[in-house]
């Protein structure tokens, strides 16, 4: 999915107003220290790409991301703002049901959602001049 | 805990170069921007600009270009600003700052350092 | 650039009522705007982000309403320690701006 023609202004506001609460409670009783972040991104089509990545796509040592709160509210926001996002995830989500598994919070997965925190970070300030 | 720790104070003569330090700790210092803001005696806050120690990227204001350079040492977590060809308009109280966890806010700041440019 | 305009520059207030300092911008900054209070001989501190956000330890007593390029941070009653220099802040477009900052005294 090309990412150009969301509504960033409304994508940013819905992640301030919740999204970030739900990654701060995940991360909860982790050391700010912890984790280095290693998935960088460039504008906000690019990071939103990297953000549905991540918190989408099933990744060895953690597989279960799409069925976090903040995970639903992303994809909420994606399907509101970004037009015709909603049909390119049917088939994912479909997919998706079939391997449902039980949600376990390991480290690996407190690392994937210490890097959404920071590709958000970038989203919401993009350091590029036009943004 | 998270702290932003910077170099003394300065005093230099006009037309010479000035490098002030920011070490920081109680973070992972490669994931959060540093900015860089001054305050001239009685005066406002005025933006320098930002780097990102993850990268090296920077975004600086236009009236600091050239003259201010943004860096940052991951081994030892520290950000620096350099600015040359000072100038008597360049007295100031410097403070680093840290982005917030929203990138939306400074939350962290330094203690500030003092550089006078005097002849 | 965009210009962030303060106004009142200095309000004195009786302990416990309320005060009220505006900031409007020169062209919209959409709800990119921070508050900063900066105490006597202190660095700035945070108070409010993206427009109505509390930062955490921040007294419900402040609040932050606004979009586009009128802007408000209110402190519904007044403390000695809220004394010191309030600054808001855009963050929308680059270079990033600050209001003049307004003064604000205890009478």
């Known amino acids: 999915y090309d990412f150009t023609n969301c509504d960033f202004e409304k994508i940013k506001a819905a992640y301030l107003s919740t999204i970030s609460k739900d990654l701060i409670t995940y991360m909860s009783g982790t050391k700010s220290t912890e984790f280095n972040n290693t998935v960088s991104c460039s504008n906000r089509p690019h990071c939103l790409t990297e953000i549905q990545s991540l918190t989408f796509n099933p990744t060895a040592g953690c597989a279960s991301l799409a069925k976090e709160m903040f995970a639903m509210k992303t994809k909420a926001a994606l399907a509101i703002w970004c037009p015709g996002y909603s049909e390119t995830q049917i088939n994912a989500t479909q997919a998706m049901k079939k391997r449902r598994k039980r949600k376990v919070t390991t480290n690996k997965c407190l690392e994937q959602v210490s890097q959404l925190q920071g590709l958000w970070r970038r989203f919401n300030r993009p350091l590029l001049k036009q943004q | 805990e998270v702290q932003l720790v910077q170099s003394g104070a300065e005093v230099k003569k006009p037309g010479s170069s000035v490098k002030v330090s920011c070490k920081a700790s109680?973070?992972?210092?490669?994931?959060?921007?540093i900015e860089w803001v001054r305050q001239a005696p009685g005066q406002g806050l005025e933006w320098i600009g930002v780097?990102?120690?993850?990268?090296?990227?920077?975004n600086y204001n236009e009236n600091f270009k050239g003259r201010a350079t943004l860096t940052a040492d991951k081994s030892t977590s520290t950000a620096y600003i350099e600015l040359s060809s000072l100038r008597s308009e360049d007295t100031a109280v410097y403070y680093c700052?840290?982005?917030?966890?929203?990138?939306?806010?400074?939350?962290?700041w330094g203690q500030g350092t003092t550089v006078t440019v005097s002849s | 650039d965009i210009v962030m305009t303060q106004t009142p520059l200095s309000l004195s207030v009786t302990p416990g009522q309320p005060a009220s300092i505006s900031c409007k911008a020169s062209q919209s900054v959409s709800s990119d705007v921070t508050w900063y209070l900066q105490k006597p001989g202190q660095s700035p501190q945070l108070l409010i982000y993206y427009v109505s956000n509390h930062y955490t330890g921040v007294p419900d007593r402040f609040s932050g309403s606004g979009s586009g390029t009128d802007f408000t941070l209110k402190i519904s009653r007044v403390e000695a320690e809220d004394v010191g220099v309030y600054y808001c802040q855009q963050h929308h477009r680059f270079p990033l701006t600050f209001g003049q900052g307004t003064k604000l005294e205890i009478k």
């Open positions: 700052a840290r982005e917030d966890n929203t990138g939306t806010a400074f939350d962290y």
């Open positions: 109680g973070y992972t210092f490669s994931n959060y921007l």
């Open positions: 780097i990102d120690p993850g990268n090296g990227d920077t």
